[in-house]
């Protein structure tokens, strides 16, 4: 939800976390604000303290339970409210009825590892973290490889249009250092977005054997 210079955005990680960002220009850095979450069909409610992440934005994580517990479903609506302290009173700044499975952003993939590396090829695998079993196989991935002398932004995106937690990188240069990242996105949800990129995995291709073209 947006109003001029104020904006309130939240995403559900599909299990037990709703992450929110509240931004407003001209607010004091020491303003005390909170996000309150009230599900329409659950007995619990949750609050988190918004902490500054930049000059005009604050963020917090609503921890709904154990990391892998399924705390919300596709039929839930969670009313999220931003409340900021002004003097002795709390002022409601934003109200958003939040459909968790329409606003998904999964955790970054984890456990990246080199399965097999050759002179021109490298097979890499990873795992998804805290992703709901509701998705079954309805996930897609994007991957990118950092080559020497280039930036991540220049790296071409490789798209995997299915739940495939491995990739075989080809046409690599022998005896060269690379880095690799991957991110994930469910197919479900009108406002769903890509997860953050994984931590980069560094690997080196094998040197070419002397007198051989491999």
């Amino acid at each position: 939800a947006v109003n001029g210079t104020s904006q309130f955005t939240c995403f559900y990680n599909s299990r037990a976390n709703i992450s929110c960002v509240w931004s407003q220009d001209g607010a004091l850095q020491d303003t005390s604000c909170q996000v309150h979450a009230w599900p329409d069909r659950r007995r619990w409610n949750q609050t988190c303290e918004l902490l500054p992440v930049s000059q005009a934005s604050w963020a917090c994580n609503l921890i709904l339970g154990a990391p892998d517990s399924q705390k919300l479903t596709t039929v839930d609506i969670v009313t999220l409210r931003v409340l900021c302290r002004e003097g002795v009173r709390w002022r409601v700044m934003a109200i958003q009825d939040f459909k968790p499975f329409e606003n998904l952003r999964l955790m970054a993939p984890i456990s990246l590892q080199v399965v097999h590396v050759e002179t021109h090829r490298c097979n890499i695998s990873w795992e998804i973290s805290q992703a709901s079993h509701y998705f079954e196989r309805h996930l897609e991935f994007e991957a990118r490889t950092l080559s020497p002398g280039h930036t991540w932004e220049e790296a071409p995106l490789l798209t995997l249009k299915q739940k495939q937690e491995w990739i075989c990188l080809e046409t690599l240069t022998p005896d060269t250092q690379y880095e690799f990242q991957v991110r994930v996105k469910p197919l479900q949800g009108e406002f769903t977005t890509w997860s953050p990129w994984s931590q980069p995995l560094a690997f080196r291709t094998k040197p070419a054997a002397l007198g051989k073209d491999t």
Epitope: V2, N3, G4, F8, R81, V92, M93, A94, I95, Q96
Partner: nanobody, 124 residues
């Protein structure tokens, strides 16, 4: 469908008060947020106050501490109590309703239902 009908507008002196009402009818159970907008000629509608089912209210800075939004669920009526009125409060006031609340500082985004409006004039 939901129907909204505003009333209570009129002319008032600077510093005076008015209470606007918005009668709601139809499928009111689907409504999760209600609010007030205002518009002056040649300008966009400005969201100034909104309230959710639980009675949490949010206001634009321009009316905070002067206007109060309230609802009477038994009567299916929304109110806007306007105090310490200023000439710049002169506008057409519209009632609005949402099936899903999306409100920041009194301004709803994605309004599902509108009233036809009631005129408020503040003269010095």
């Amino acid at each position: 469908q939901v129907q909204l009908q505003e009333s209570g507008g009129g002319s008032v002196q600077v510093g005076g008060s008015l209470r606007l009402s918005c009668a709601t009818s139809g499928d009111t159970k689907s409504i999760r947020c209600m609010g007030w907008f205002r518009q002056t000629p040649g300008k966009e509608r400005e969201g100034i106050a909104a309230i959710d089912r639980e009675g949490f209210a949010t206001y634009a800075d321009s009316v905070y501490d002067r206007f109060t939004i309230a609802q009477d669920n038994a009567q299916n009526t929304l109110y806007l109590e306007m105090n310490a009125l200023k000439p710049e409060d002169t506008a057409m006031y519209y009632c609005a309703a949402q099936n899903m609340c999306r409100v920041v500082r009194g301004a709803m985004t994605g309004v599902d239902y509108w009233g036809k409006g009631t005129q408020v004039t503040v003269s010095s």
